[in-house]
């Protein structure tokens, strides 16, 4: 906390400009009017303040807005955003996607901080659902964002938003999350033709039930082994050898290398040896 002292004669700030970098912390406290700072927040990031000085500016804004900052100020916080605590951010009402983008940009290239997580939570709750534009923005900054949500939170994602999801966004999702996302993806892509549909749905197949895998096996999709290994074991077990052969196409030979790993191991044990032998891979049930 900076001690309150009177502003020296002639040092009262008339605007937020570069001259303020030469102000000591107590001078910033005494000579910068909080209302002026709030109206000229957009200038702060262009001025090479130390983070110590930014602490003082934050303190001034906190005094001016004890109930939380207005969005007009939040949008221009820039580096000052990283001085905010999750408690500060919980007081905000952020409704503009542009504001969200501006603040995410400040933390770009870094793991999601508690501040960012709180900001996103406030924003999404304010919107009521995770719409396509928001999801587009969040996954662009944080590819793992979707997989950080609980299945309950994912249930609020509308199927239309699934179009924004890229394969890498699902890399860290567990089966429970894919169970929620898969039906939404199926709905979102239902009007696409066979090969295009498979390209889009492939990343979500970890949530697919047996009957959908059987249907895919009739469409010459040539699923790769990496995708097959991510399928639900309970969905794979009922598939026949012929169905798996059709599902994998030329990739069926890869089963040999994966015969000790789930779901391949469990599936092999469920098959008749005669059927396995038709693959010519030496798989032992």
């Amino acid at each position: 906390e900076v001690e309150k002292t009177a502003c020296p004669s002639g040092k009262k700030a008339r605007e937020i400009d570069e001259s303020l970098i030469f102000y000591k912390k107590w001078e910033l406290e005494a000579c910068v009017d909080a209302a002026l700072l709030a109206t000229q927040m957009d200038r702060v990031n262009a001025i090479p303040f130390t983070y110590e000085q930014l602490d003082v500016l934050k303190h001034k804004l906190d005094e001016l807005y004890p109930q939380g900052y207005p969005e007009s100020v939040i949008q221009h916080l820039g580096y000052l955003f990283l001085k905010m605590s999750p408690e500060d951010i919980r007081k905000w009402n952020v409704t503009s996607l542009e504001t969200l983008k501006a603040l995410l940009e400040v933390n770009k290239g870094h793991e999601m901080s508690p501040q960012v997580a709180t900001l996103i939570d406030r924003f999404v709750k304010g919107r009521g659902q995770l719409d396509k534009d928001t999801l587009d923005t969040l996954t662009a900054f944080y590819p793992g964002y979707l997989c950080s949500l609980s299945p309950e939170e994912l249930s609020s994602v509308p199927p239309s938003s699934i179009w924004a999801v890229r394969p890498q966004d699902l890399d860290t999702c567990d089966p429970r999350q894919l169970d929620v996302l898969y039906p939404k993806a199926r709905l979102a892509f239902q009007n696409m033709n066979g090969s295009e549909y498979f390209v889009k749905i492939q990343s979500f197949l970890g949530g697919a039930p047996t009957e959908d895998l059987k249907a895919l096996s009739q469409q010459n999709v040539s699923m790769d082994l990496a995708t097959f290994m991510k399928l639900r074991t309970d969905a794979v077990l009922p598939l026949t050898v012929a169905e798996v052969q059709k599902l994998l196409g030329p990739h069926v030979e890869g089963l040999k290398a994966e015969e000790r790993h789930r779901p391949v191991r469990d599936w092999i044990l469920r098959q008749r040896q005669d059927d396995l032998d038709t693959l010519g891979l030496g798989l032992q049930g």
Partner: nanobody, 123 residues
Framework: QVQLVESGGGVVQPGRSLRLSCAAS????????MHWFRQAPGKERELVAT????????YYADSVKGRFTISRDNSKNTLYLQMNSLRAEDTAVYYC????????????????WGQGTLVTVSS
């Protein structure tokens, strides 16, 4: 964590020159701002000069304008302060400070400081 080590201080006569160096253990090319501060005996620390790296803009306190020059060498990760026409009132401990963009060095919005180097201007 980034360590900053200043050097180049010493005793010098009025009117002479000195060049201070500040060697950083991390890269300075990604810094947001770089500063030289000084603190004279019994006085508050004050900013002497700053480089705003994004715009490559240089700022100087009125008391040193035209006499001091701040510069950097990214290849050596070193910040410099060339001090000419030194005066008795320039006597102080000089500190360098570097502020990184938050996505460098653990996302912490933090100013890294050196331990300081003493400059004494005396006849």
């Amino acid at each position: 964590q980034v360590q900053l080590v200043e050097s180049g201080g010493g005793v010098v006569q009025p009117g002479r020159s000195l060049r201070l160096s500040c060697a950083a253990s991390g890269t300075i090319s990604t810094a947001r701002t770089m500063h030289w501060f000084r603190q004279a005996p019994g006085k508050e620390r004050e900013l002497v000069a700053t480089i705003s790296t994004g715009t490559n803009t240089y700022y100087y306190a009125d008391s040193v304008k035209g006499r001091f020059t701040i510069s950097r060498d990214n290849s050596k990760n070193t910040l410099y302060l060339q001090m000419n026409s030194l005066r008795a009132e320039d006597t102080a401990v000089y500190y360098c400070a570097v502020s990184y963009y938050p996505n460098e060095y653990d996302g912490v919005p933090y100013d890294y400081w050196g331990q300081g180097t003493l400059v004494t201007v005396s006849s």
